[in-house]
């Protein structure tokens, strides 16, 4: 199957990287993170029509079965294919520390 | 956050491994796979409520932002955390061959 990048639903409707501006309060982090105070969160949002950015064989199977049994099998879902790291200044028992999280910001997206 | 395994929506409603019985025709494989004729497809299906089988920090963020902006940010989605391999007997130009696919059957599930 083609691992297509052209969205048949119209521009911007299919699975792609979106940026959502969020504060520490929005993220539920205000009690343990000091900095940054605001984060540009990159995440994967959008529909996964047939053959669009299919991650693997499983995604192809899922789409075929979804067509057959839409009430039982959901369509593939738009999720991160990889992540970008992000460093946080966080509170600790003894003061503050730096910690890098490598599963926080989506880097690119695919359908699974 | 807890990486919980107890479904708050009731037994079997949350993200978990399901088995769907499918023929080669169902899968769209009839023209290139010879065997097996039928497959017990394991896939990840179910809701992803807060703190349920969260795959990583990104899933936590997504849930928090979904609560704040449900029309913009979807809830985390139930997808495979790992896969089981499967061997297919498939047609080739010169006859038949065995091919192992390692991204075909879901082994376990989580919410991303």
């Amino acid at each position: 199957a083609r691992n297509g990048d052209r969205c048949p639903l119209g521009p911007g409707r299919c699975c792609r990287l979106h940026t959502v501006h969020a504060s520490l309060e929005d993220l539920g982090w205000a009690d343990w993170v000091l900095s940054p105070r605001e984060v540009q969160v990159t995440m994967c949002i959008g529909a996964c029509p047939s053959q669009f950015r299919e991650a693997n064989m499983h995604a192809q199977i899922k789409m075929n079965l979804h067509r057959l049994k839409p009430d039982t099998v959901p369509a593939p879902c738009c999720v991160p294919a990889s992540y970008n790291p992000m460093v946080l200044i966080q509170k600790t028992d003894t003061g503050v520390s730096l910690q890098t999280y490598d599963d926080l910001l989506a880097k690119d997206c695919h359908c699974v | 956050a807890r990486n919980g395994d107890r479904c708050p929506l009731g037994p079997g409603r949350c993200c978990r491994l399901h088995t769907v019985h499918a023929s080669l025709e169902d899968l769209g494989w009839a023209d290139w796979v010879l065997s097996p004729r039928e497959v017990q497809v394991t896939m990840c299906i179910g809701a992803c409520p807060s703190q349920f089988r969260e795959a990583n920090m990104h899933a936590q963020i997504k849930m928090n932002l979904h609560r704040l902006k449900p029309d913009t940010v979807p809830a985390p989605c139930c997808v495979p955390a790992s896969y089981n391999p499967m061997v297919l007997i498939q047609k080739t130009d010169t006859g038949v061959s065995l091919q192992t696919y390692d991204d075909l059957l879901a082994k376990d599930c989580h919410c991303v």
Partner: antibody
């Protein structure tokens, strides 16, 4: 142009105080952190610490904790590294670097400030 | 603190050679490792971030790989301008630490 410009070379005597600077331009100074890195003559790079200019949070490497002070003045987009009492062993090149917390890397570096401490 | 050990500490190579530098962390740092290049009298320059991501503007002959404790920087075909000292740097958690450096010299 995005750049960090450091203050000029300094020659000091043991026991003297010193404050060197690192001025950011071409970007929003409070959107990035600033780190300081030491390089003693003929030696490798050593991470000293980091500051968030927007909140003035500082984190030091244990090797440098209590030996130096890192500060910033966001109103003039400048970070500082200072000593209250220099030692001969502080003789080194000091670099400031812009830290992108997205990606976690030092993408822009100052040209370095050479500090010489000698009696 | 996490110790970063680079090897070799120095190497001699010719233009066109494939060069590999390794870096080992004393404990797992996931992929939270960067590589920097430094030429004499100059500030370091970022080559690779997050173990394998090429920084914008860096030639594609540079590549990084590895995860956990073992990492590699590879220069596929050494160019005259690549003779320099290379440092790995872990930023998994503070205190961040550099490797001791690998000097790449002309054979």
């Amino acid at each position: 142009e995005v750049q960090l410009v450091q203050s000029g070379a300094e020659v000091k005597k043991p026991g003297e105080s010193l404050k060197i600077s690192c001025k950011g331009s071409g970007y929003s100074f409070t959107d990035y952190w600033i780190s300081w890195v030491r390089q003693m003559p003929g030696k490798g790079l050593e991470w000293m610490g980091i500051i968030d200019p927007s909140g003035s949070y500082t984190i030091y490497s244990p090797s440098f904790q209590g030996q130096v002070t890192i500060s910033a003045d966001k109103s003039i987009s400048t970070a500082y590294l200072q000593w209250s009492s220099l030692k001969a062993s502080d003789t080194a090149m000091y670099y400031c670097a812009r830290v992108s917390y997205y990606g976690g890397y030092f993408d822009i570096w100052g040209q370095g400030t050479l500090v010489t401490v000698s009696s | 603190d996490i110790q970063m050990t680079q090897s070799p500490s120095s190497l001699s190579a010719s233009v066109g050679d494939r060069v590999t530098i390794t870096c080992r962390a004393s404990q797992s740092i996931s992929n939270n490792l960067n590589w920097y290049q430094q030429k004499p009298g100059k500030a370091p320059k970022l080559l690779i971030y997050a173990a394998s991501n090429l920084q914008s503007g860096v030639p594609s002959r540079f590549s990084g790989s590895g995860s956990g404790t073992d990492f590699t920087l590879t220069i596929s075909s050494l160019q005259p301008e690549d003779f320099a000292t290379y440092y790995c740097f872990q930023l998994d958690h503070s205190p961040f630490t550099f490797g001791q450096g690998t000097k790449v010299e002309i054979k």
